[in-house]
């Protein structure tokens, strides 16, 4: 008996061939001997089976002695043995229909679990293997689970169902809802305008939800909400914003926030959360602001940074085109009685400059100029 595997919702074509290469009488029946379809000369005839409106044949092949049974929009319950009667012969084909579906939704939040469930006909014992977009293989029986979805899990999952040495392939598109970056750091000189961007790692036609940016300033004892906003069909509208700082927000995606001035009191860490409509859980992106200030007070030239810096960052003070006078893994450095000239304060990571502030030291009879 020939075995054919089908996919739920798809179309399958079961073949039946006569030795005579011409159109002759044929009938397709199911295992209960109920007629599905056949022919009356050049016309199709349909029986009282439950497949009636989903069964068809390919008439262009009849004149070549081929009488296929086409079943559209396959259902699991279409799994059966189908019998083709032609030329006093009977050809039997066993059809097994499988379905593979993702739990509840194919749009999942980062960190959530993905469960794939296999629907199979009674009496079958299939095995399933799925390959994620990043090449990770998972195996299982009726259900397969992947916990802690990551951004790289977005894309097409390819699952192979194996039964009777035959296989059928399913492709399921999974969208992991997340921000492009989990965390970002913005380095700014005091007084500069700060731009925070929160690009999403997915695109959907309609995006609706609400969000909030909580900020923990380094100097503050507790965090506070800087801004709350709504998102409706990709349009952003601000609900509430603090007076200090007075953030501005872009009306379109990607989410974009502007802080008019980088000030030491704003340096710190923020957490932007986005709750999407019809989704449990929230998307998160951490954002950090590091602010630098270079000052000269009497005979002391000081450079300071505020905000979340890693211990391996180096803070230096140097006169232009000269070696650094001072370099420390600290958040403040200074030089007493600095020479006249253009001084540079540098925040660097393994030789790569992250932030730079220049200050001009004038001869002692004049006052300093800060460009």
């Amino acid at each position: 008996k020939k075995v054919v595997l089908g996919k739920k919702g798809d179309t399958v074509e079961l073949t039946c061939t006569a030795s005579q290469k011409k159109s002759i009488q044929f009938h397709w029946k199911n295992s209960n001997q109920i007629k599905i379809l056949g022919n009356q000369g050049s016309f199709l005839t349909k029986g009282p089976s439950k497949l009636n409106d989903r069964a068809d044949s390919r008439r262009s092949l009849w004149d070549q002695g081929n009488f296929p049974l086409i079943i559209k929009n396959l259902k699991i319950e279409d799994s059966d043995t189908y019998i083709c009667e032609v030329e006093d012969q009977k050809e039997e084909v066993q059809l097994l229909v499988f379905g593979l579906t993702a739990n509840s939704d194919t749009h999942l939040l980062q960190g959530q679990s993905l469960t794939l469930t296999l629907e199979s006909p009674p009496g079958s014992s299939p095995s399933v293997q799925c390959r994620s977009p990043r090449g990770k293989n998972i195996q299982g029986g009726k259900t397969l689970s992947v916990s802690q979805l990551e951004l790289q899990d977005s894309g097409t999952w390819t699952c192979t169902v194996l039964q009777n040495q035959k296989k059928v392939e399913f492709k399921i598109d999974i969208v992991v809802l997340a921000f492009q970056k989990a965390s970002s750091i913005v380095y700014k000189k005091e007084g500069e305008q700060v731009e925070f961007s929160f690009p999403l790692a997915f695109t959907v036609e309609k995006l609706t939800g609400s969000g909030e940016l909580w900020w923990q300033a380094e100097r503050a004892s507790s965090s506070k909400s800087w801004i709350t906003f709504d998102l409706k069909n990709k349009e952003v509208s601000v609900k509430r914003v603090t007076q200090d700082p007075k953030l501005q927000m872009g009306k379109k995606l990607p989410l974009h926030l502007t802080l008019p001035q980088a000030l030491p009191q704003y340096a710190g860490s923020g957490n932007l959360t986005l709750a999407l409509e019809a989704k449990t859980g929230k998307l998160h992106q951490e954002v950090n602001l590091v602010v630098m200030r270079a000052t000269q007070l009497q005979k002391n030239l000081t450079c300071e940074v505020w905000g979340p810096t890693s211990p391996k960052l180096m803070l230096s003070l140097k006169l232009e085109n000269k070696e650094a006078k001072v370099s420390k893994r600290e958040k403040a450095v200074w030089v007493l009685n600095p020479e006249a000239g253009m001084w540079q304060c540098l925040l660097s990571d393994s030789g790569q400059v992250l932030l730079e502030s220049n200050i001009k030291v004038l001869p002692t009879w004049s006052t300093p100029v800060q460009p």
Partner: antibody, heavy 120, light 107 residues
Amino acid sequence: EVQLLESGGGLVQPGGSLRLSCAASGFTVGSWYMSWVRQAPGKGLEWVAGIWYEGSNKYYADSVKGRFTISRDNSKNTLYLQMNSLRAEDTAVYYCARLGTASLPYFDYWGQGTLVTVSS
Amino acid sequence: DIQMTQSPSSLSASVGDRVTITCRASQDIRSYLAWYQQKPGKAPKLLIYAASSLQSGVPSRFSGSGSGTDFTLTISSLQPEDFATYYCQQSYTAPPTFGQGTRLEIK
């Protein structure tokens, strides 16, 4: 050139019999699905019967099943319709028609028709 | 059996007019539909088959469209010889069935 020519029509009493013939030229009747189609006066077209290939498979409209018999004589290249137990509602012009192939199942050639009148 | 319903039953038009006749099947017949023209006292003549294919020798002013359950026959510019009765017929499942006809008359 394909041609179909019907004959055998006429006036017959209810319950009577009549045999219609359709002589074909330009093709072989035994290689095609052949049909009889009728048209009552002032009415539409109604398929009556069909015969396929060597004549082993015959099909009928429910309205004539058990009363009419379709057949053919390949040697004479002729199609027949034997009509028994005729009723007044069988009064019509009877056409013989050839059906195209399985992939093009349409009546591509028709005869000129023969009138059958069932009346007492 | 599949029922075929034509509309309108009759239609008056003038030479040069564009005319459309519709045919509806009681169930999906894919594209297995033919249109025939019949003149008084004559046999039907095949115009269109497979819903939209023009039978050889039929003028190009005749065209057919549709699939599934809804079909149309269009005559782009009526000629005097086009005044006749038109029938649609399904060939999807046995038995083949015809529409009741549309009589096209001169206005």
